[in-house]
Interface confidence: low
């Protein structure tokens, strides 16, 4: 079973998928459609890198531009370096400016 066939089978269960499952899927050439991506848990999407989202969506990555003001895309963009977002060539704006320090807030919260 190839990545696309596997994706069709598990598509209906993806809404609550954790980050690790999404990272694994991104390695399987599944080309997740935007409608499915938009239903994912925001907290599961946030840790994904630009490269992982690009692999996860495949040819559908271009649709991020249309959804840049909506969750979870909006929140995900805010967590990415602008430099990395620029590599997609989609004109996505709102990432962390170059030279800014990125703090791991989840670690900070765990310690407080």
């Amino acid at each position: 079973m190839n990545g696309s066939e596997y994706f069709v089978k598990i598509q209906s269960f993806l809404g609550g998928a954790p980050t690790e499952d999404l990272k694994a899927l991104s390695q399987q050439n599944v080309s997740m459609d935007l409608a499915t991506f938009m239903k994912l848990r925001t907290d599961a999407v946030l840790p994904l890198t630009v490269a992982e989202v690009q692999k996860l969506l495949g040819p559908h990555v271009e649709g991020l531009k249309a959804e840049e003001r909506h969750r979870p895309v909006r929140d995900w963009i805010l967590r990415q370096r602008q430099d990395d977002l620029d590599t997609l060539g989609l004109g996505l704006q709102g990432g962390i400016p170059n030279g800014y320090l990125v703090l791991d807030l989840s670690m900070q919260e765990a310690l407080s």
Epitope: D33, L34, A35, P59, H60, V61, E62, G63, K65, A66, E68, R69, T87, L88, G89, L90, G91
Partner: antibody, heavy 120, light 107 residues
């Protein structure tokens, strides 16, 4: 059936502006980006930019940023491109071409094109 | 910007023959490539997307192949109506860019 109506020709004077229209039918207008492509006589194709009819967001080829302005009128399912400060270099056929917002932009449909002639 | 190079501006072939039009990208574009056919006085017509998938209604004598930087459009059993100019286009990143075109002439 997807249809894209463009005027056949526009004759304009150097230094003037022109607004080209592309009236779409046969699909959900707000679900498709509208792209614009330039072709000078006997030459290749150049991508000018695209506009998202659902929110007016746009992307431009840097080369055309000060030349073209892309807008849409959702009520009439029409995309417009205004070209300003026209010179002979702008004499070309201009095509509109939509593509579905959730996929990468290969152009399955093209308008017939508008021939713009800049002549004094 | 990604530069798409179609090194052959003209290609001559005969009806029934096979012809291959090539296109080279200046950087890796995966399979984010489309091919178009344009006949004199007409709009471009989409033939191939994602490097190798035919649009519906396109005859199966048109085949696309390649990935990364090197791509080929092959026409087998060339017909007289295939007389046209062929363009490749990358849609891996903005700005979208096209090759300069290859004119296929029938002997």
């Amino acid at each position: 059936q997807v249809q894209l109506q463009q005027p056949g020709t526009e004759l304009v004077k150097p230094g003037a502006s022109v607004k080209l229209s592309c009236k779409a039918s046969g699909y959900t207008f707000t679900s498709y980006w509208m792209h614009w492509v330039k072709q000078r006589p006997g030459q290749g194709l150049e991508w000018i930019g695209n506009v998202n009819p659902s929110n007016g967001g746009s992307n431009y080829n840097e080369k055309f940023k000060n030349k073209a302005t892309l807008t849409v009128d959702k009520s009439s399912s029409t995309a417009d491109m205004q070209l300003n400060s026209l010179t002979s270099e702008d004499s070309a056929v201009y095509y509109c071409a939509p593509h579905y917002i959730g996929s990468r932009p290969g152009f399955a449909y093209w308008g017939q094109g508008t021939l713009v002639t800049v002549s004094g | 910007d990604i530069v798409m190079t179609q090194s052959q501006k003209f290609m001559s072939t005969s009806v029934g023959d096979r012809v291959s039009v090539t296109c080279k990208a200046s950087q890796n574009v995966g399979t984010n490539i489309a091919w178009y056919q344009q006949k004199p006085g007409q709009s471009p017509k989409a033939l191939i997307y994602s490097a190798s998938y035919r649009y519906s209604g396109v005859p199966d004598r048109f085949t696309g192949s390649g990935s990364g930087t090197d791509f080929t459009l092959t026409i087998t059993n060339v017909q007289s109506e295939d007389l046209a100019e062929y363009f490749c286009q990358q849609y891996n990143s903005y700005p979208l860019t096209f090759g300069g075109g290859t004119k296929v002439e029938i002997k």
